[in-house]
Amino acid sequence: FERTRSLQDPCSNCPAGTFCDNNRNQICSPCPPNSFSSAGGQRTCDICRQCKGVFRTRKECSSTSNAECDCTPGFHCLGAGCSMCEQDCKQGQELTKKGCKDCCFGTFNDQKRGICRPWTNCSLDGKSVLVNGTKERDVVCGPSPADLSPGASSVTPPAPAREPGHSPQ
């Protein structure tokens, strides 16, 4: 019965960009201005999303697809389909309820969004710190301290990198 009913349902013939109009004996009517239906067989058209305030229009609404928003400069999208805009901070900062705050010692953030994360603990992998961390950058772990002791390895150390712009003496 369900299959028979769907075959006889006049609404199933209504294409995207239209809706099945109950006020007109279920004929397919084009979506009114500033509304859309992205699939066939719809009984209503959805109101177009409006990108206002901190949101800006990335893609205009059409009768068959909704508008898409992103955020104005200085903000970034959060949530599915950019449902919210959140303020950017600088690298080395995180957004708190009181605004952008520098990362605490021992943490870093290399992006304009997100939270400060702890530096990598090199010793957990048995390695040593090769380059210290900053608010903007994680530490760089190097060989283990044992590898650095004299005679611990027969591997030839790499040649020091030349600074750009200097020719060999």
Epitope: P30, C31, P33, N34, E60, C61, S62, S63, T64
Partner: nanobody
Framework: AVQLVESGGGLVQSGGSLRLSCAAS????????IAWYRQGPGKQRELVAW???????HYVDSAKGRFAIWRDNTKKTTYLQMNSLKLEDTDVYYC?????WGQGTQVTVSS
């Protein structure tokens, strides 16, 4: 209210062409949606082609590749060019915008 008047229907041989016109008078918004429907005796009106509020032309599957809809805003007229007509295209064709309907124009395709 908007008044719509269709013209251009008639008798044409299978494979032939017709151009229907829909002249609008009254207060028409620049975003107005205009559509062509067809209706046979004892049947429901069926959408054929329409110009959406975003000014994009759309067609039902049976009209794709054969029919073309466009409008001339200076003349407040919308056209439906019907090519490669088939016997099953025989119907009364109506122009519609919002709650306004034209009186219809008969299209008859003969073999």
């Amino acid at each position: 209210a908007v008044q719509l008047v269709e013209s251009g229907g008639g008798l044409v041989q299978s494979g032939g062409s017709l151009r229907l016109s829909c002249a609008a008078s009254g207060n028409i918004s620049s975003l107005h949606v205009i559509a062509w429907y067809r209706q046979g005796p004892g049947k429901q009106r069926e959408l054929v082609a329409w110009i959406a509020w975003d000014d994009i032309a759309h067609y039902v599957d049976s009209a794709k590749g054969r029919f073309a809809i466009w409008r001339d805003n200076t003349k407040k007229t919308t056209y439906l060019q019907m090519n490669s007509l088939k016997l099953e295209d025989t119907d009364v064709y109506y122009c519609n915008s919002g709650d306004s309907w034209g009186q219809g124009t008969q299209v008859t395709v003969s073999s």
